[in-house]
């Protein structure tokens, strides 16, 4: 008789999850010489230890502490790019602007990007059938707690001018419930961070509105100002041109507003 298994509302662990994490770790440490000292087997052991045999609705930031510690790395604190609901463009940008970093350009972010994982209480099995959904099941699930933990640490490390890319096509350009709005904004350190600069990315080609005047951006400005951090905002009207100009800043068409 098959053992009863908890059925969650979200998709199960990504297939070949252990192999994927280990392979990504090896690849990352090969590409980044400053991380060559990292023992990827230990990183996997720490990752696994955070959720295996634990109830997937009862995960804490402390569970991830060994992984956070083993995966700590040096990122230039003044070269951090945060993003909200516009991951692909943010990643395209840092692929071109190699001296800037999103969370997914760090080892820990790279390991977990686009993956899902969870275990089961009191068994060493990984659950490939289903995992808790943040809304429908519980917020303290392995994936959500992981991203909350790494996002907090990433924001805490930031200094000087921090950039954030926001999606101007969404009804809430700044969403207080996003990871950026609920975690990163509140963990920027006012004694280290001078300015948060928002880049609002326009979706429509003919969209010439000043989205920096959007009520949700004003809300973000208010939150940031109350934390004694300056705020600035730029419209990126043509994201395609924006990326092109990052690649080729000498191009004559790149002097006009993008």
């Amino acid at each position: 008789v098959p053992r009863w298994r908890q059925q969650w509302s979200g998709p199960g662990t990504t297939k070949r999850f252990p192999e994927t994490v280990l392979a990504r770790c090896v690849k990352y440490t090969e590409i980044h010489p400053e991380m060559r000292h990292v023992d990827c087997q230990s990183v996997w052991d720490a990752f696994k230890g955070a959720f295996i045999s634990k109830h997937p609705c009862n995960i804490t930031e402390e569970d991830y502490q060994p992984l956070m510690k083993l995966g700590t790395q040096t990122v230039p604190c003044n070269k951090i790019l945060l993003w909200s609901r516009i991951k692909d463009l943010a990643h395209q940008f840092t692929q071109v602007q190699r001296d800037m970093f999103t969370l997914e350009d760090t080892l820990l972010g790279y390991l977990a990007d686009d993956l899902t994982w969870c275990g089961e209480f009191n068994t060493s099995k990984i659950n490939y059938q289903s995992c808790p959904d943040w809304r429908k099941d519980c917020s303290n699930n392995p994936v959500s707690v992981f991203w909350k933990t790494v996002s907090r640490r990433f924001a805490e490390a930031a200094c000087d001018v921090v950039h954030v890319m926001l999606n101007g096509s969404r009804s809430k350009i700044f969403d207080k419930n996003s990871t950026f709005g609920s975690v990163e904004v509140h963990n920027l350190q006012p004694e280290k961070v001078q300015t948060l600069e928002a880049w609002v990315i326009h979706g429509g080609r003919e969209d010439s509105r000043d989205l920096c005047q959007d009520p949700t951006i004003k809300e973000l400005e208010s939150i940031i100002s109350k934390r004694n951090i300056q705020f600035s905002c730029k419209n990126i009207y043509r994201p395609d041109k924006f990326l092109q100009c990052v690649k080729n800043p000498e191009d004559s068409s790149c002097t006009s507003e993008i």
């Epitope: 052991d45 230890g49 502490q65 060994p66 510690k69 040096t74």
Partner: antibody, heavy 117, light 107 residues
Amino acid sequence: QVQLVQSGAEVKKPGSSVKVSCKASGYTFTNHWIEWVRQAPGQGLEWMGDIFPGGGYTDYNEKFKGRVTITADESTSTAYMELSSLRSEDTAVYYCARGRDLAMDYWGQGTLVTVSS
Amino acid sequence: DIQMTQSPSSLSASVGDRVTITCEASQNINVWLGWYQQKPGKAPKLLIYKASNLHTGVPSRFSGSGSGTDFTLTISSLQPEDFATYYCQQGQSYPYTFGQGTKVEIK
């Protein structure tokens, strides 16, 4: 080879502060955590806190929160541990050590701090 | 805080003896356990990390085992230079904590 060399012994008055240094060599200073551990005379080992010099991340034992500050100077590959509001119970040998797989693989020679009026 | 309990607190043994020291954690620490040797007036030295991995330069007579809450350090054939105090340490969660030590003395 990996080496951690600590500053010399100190005698301090109660209420004052002490700053112990730990100069690292033989490895990339910014890539590894530096741990601070103390040992009172005839007693066991007690973890105080740590720092990741490359990112300035620090973690402290709650027992010492507010009294201990750990810093690092990348340019000289030196970590520092400052303990304030000293009392006689702080008399101990203070060690720095390099972190490795959540253990401590290389240790400094220790710095004896004596707190006495 | 995670409590680390070592036993015995001291033992007497002869050169050539097999010596076993145990360390019990008050909660699951997975494999994040280190073993150290300390001699009087000297800094501790790492013997074993991650429960069972021998640190560089440490003689193979030292071995470690265990995971979860119960761990063992074994010296297969005690040598004169092994008379010292041994400590275990957990790295699973802050604050890192050490066992109270096991003093290995000459019988």
